[in-house]
Interface confidence: medium
């Protein structure tokens, strides 16, 4: 168990012509926060796919307004690290995404707007316990510099985080056999005693230098498969008369995988791929059942109906799959009404509405012309998410407060003269013209 | 700090079944594998039975088809349920638990005994 901390140190345009001066706009004020995700491997997947280590949200940071003309300042960003605990060993292998947020704080109706602004990702090899880690990561014209390492937390130590040492009270207080970890001097650990080269899955000791064999397994390093074992004579008969394996077997052999499994050799030893409903190294194991823990996420396991289904998972909102183990994408059921932009930011979903619409997931239609007045005599018309005035005569502009020159748009066709007058315009038309406009 | 607590040892009659429990506190069960091994006076301690942390287990062949060893991540404990228990079963249980990198078993608790009479 352990944290993978991030710690963002700039975020702003990057070198280079074209980068924009800033990520909020002049007219609003704005705010940034991140979010990072985490996957075990070098894996080249999708965003959208679960941050199976995990993932974590960052405070906002402080509201920054752009002043037009003056020079572009180093944005503020959110306090403190974005840590991400992880429960298992560090896989020492992983990718990441990171994305930096906008939070929009204008008078927006229906609250403040999110918009990703940059994501940047990469696959990184990592130990547990090491020194921090610097990085610099662009994302079309943005940079983002930060640093970030990985962490065990108490009693565990070592570059996966699987050791466990033993905290003590005061310096020599190590029992006997144990030995200060390294380098945490106020903890201690067992020393590791098998012989070396034993396997940790298929071997254990008691004793230092010994390595001793789980079941089905044999060899000095308990490498090799009961059932793939030579003769003990190299040159005895051959497994056609006696059962007797030639000297030399490969791991796959005499097929070590039960139940229907086929093998496959590897560096080290081989591996099963089991048939539906066994698991296990040699799939020996039947049946995974409810005891085993098959569903994630919360997940709720009841007992299947039938052999070939020996449990289901009844996910909880927001995941899904035999297992719960993926994520659904929330934004795919169009939670959002009236055209609000759906943002699924991990913990929560948000919609971003339109003008004119409020609410959780943009379900209000509000009065466009509530508290609207449109002046000097005009009257507020409402449609479309917005308001506007249809202004009286010698009026313009959104809310009639700027006084028209009627003739300015030059109304009067086929070289006509206008004349302004205090109801509207008068179009003096030229010879064999007529009508309002001298359009006839 | 790692702790493991065994329960469940006593006297039986040959046939008879025993279940012991190993409770573990101080770190996250899940990530734990969990034994029984068991000392007979003067001789060797042996493994009787190892859960790996997905559940799968292995035991020694001379408790094949009798014990069953089981693990309850929502209660931290690791249960060897042994039935048809014969004479030969008298020893000292005890419970251990490693994580799966490690070849160790580097937790151990006291030990219960449990006596089979014939």
């Known amino acids: 168990a352990g944290v993978f901390e991030l710690q963002i140190h700039s975020f702003g345009p990057g070198p280079g012509p074209g980068a924009p001066r800033s990520p909020c706009s002049a007219r609003l004020p704005c705010r940034l926060f991140f979010r990072v995700c985490l996957k075990p491997g070098l894996s080249e997947e999708a965003a959208e796919s679960p941050c199976a280590l995990g993932a974590a949200l960052s405070a906002r940071g402080p509201v920054y307004t752009e002043q037009p003309g003056a020079p572009a300042p180093d944005l503020p960003l959110p306090d403190g690290l974005l840590q991400v605990p992880f429960r298992d060993a560090w896989p020492g292998t992983f990718s990441f995404i990171i994305e930096t947020w906008r939070e929009e704080l204008g008078d927006q109706i229906g609250g403040p707007a999110w918009s990703l602004l940059a994501r940047v990702a990469g696959r990184r090899r990592l130990a547990a316990g090491g020194p921090w880690a610097r990085d610099i990561q662009r994302a079309g014209a943005w940079e983002l510099r930060f640093s970030y390492r990985a962490r065990c937390e108490p009693p565990a130590v070592g570059t996966a985080c699987t050791r466990l040492c033993r905290p003590r009270s005061a310096p020599s207080r190590c029992g006997p056999g144990l030995r200060p970890c390294a380098p945490l001097e106020d903890e201690c650990e067992a020393p590791l005693v098998c012989r070396a080269g034993c396997s940790p899955e298929h071997g254990f000791c008691e004793q230092p230098g010994e390595c001793r064999c789980l079941e089905g397994w044999t060899g000095p390093l308990c490498t090799v498969p009961v059932s793939t074992s030579s003769c003990l004579s190299p040159r005895g008969p051959s497994s056609a008369t006696t059962g007797c394996l030639v000297p030399g077997p490969g791991p796959c052999d005499g097929n070590p995988c039960a139940n229907g499994g086929s093998c496959s050799e590897t560096p080290r030893s081989f591996e099963c791929t089991c048939p539906r409903g066994f698991y296990g190294l040699r799939c020996e194991v039947s049946g995974v059942t409810c005891a085993d823990g098959p569903c994630f996420n919360g997940g709720l396991c009841v007992g299947g109906a039938d052999p070939d289904s020996a449990y289901i998972c009844h996910c909880p909102p927001g995941f899904q799959g035999s297992n719960c183990e993926k994520r659904v994408d929330r934004c795919s059921l169009q939670p959002c009404r009236n055209g609000g932009l759906c943002l699924d930011l991990g913990h929560a979903l948000r919609c971003r509405c339109r003008a004119g619409f409020a609410g959780p997931r943009c379900e209000h239609d509000l009065d466009d012309c509530a508290g609207r007045a449109c002046a000097n005599g005009g009257t507020c018309v409402e449609g479309g998410g917005a308001h506007r005035c249809s202004c009286a005569l010698g009026f313009g502009g959104r809310d009639c407060r700027e006084r028209a020159d009627p003739c300015a748009a030059r109304p009067c066709a086929h070289g006509g003269r206008c004349y302004a007058h205090f109801s509207g315009l008068v179009c003096a038309c030229a010879p064999g013209y007529m009508g309002a406009r001298c359009e006839f | 700090q790692v702790k493991l607590v065994e329960s469940g040892g006593g006297l039986v009659q040959a046939g008879g079944s025993l279940r012991l429990s190993c409770t573990v506190s101080?770190?996250?069960?899940?990530?734990?594998?969990m034994a029984w091994f068991r000392q007979a006076p003067g001789k060797e301690r042996q493994l009787v039975s190892l859960v790996a942390t997905a559940g799968n287990s292995v035991y020694a062949d001379s408790v094949k088809g009798r014990f069953t060893l089981s693990r309850d991540n929502a209660h931290s404990t690791a249960y060897l349920q042994m039935n048809g228990l014969k004479p030969e079963d008298t020893a000292m249980y005890y419970c251990a638990a490693r994580t799966d990198s490690e070849h160790a078993f580097k937790f151990w608790g006291q030990g219960t005994q449990v006596t089979v009479s014939s």
């Open positions: 101080g770190f996250t069960f899940d990530d734990l594998v």
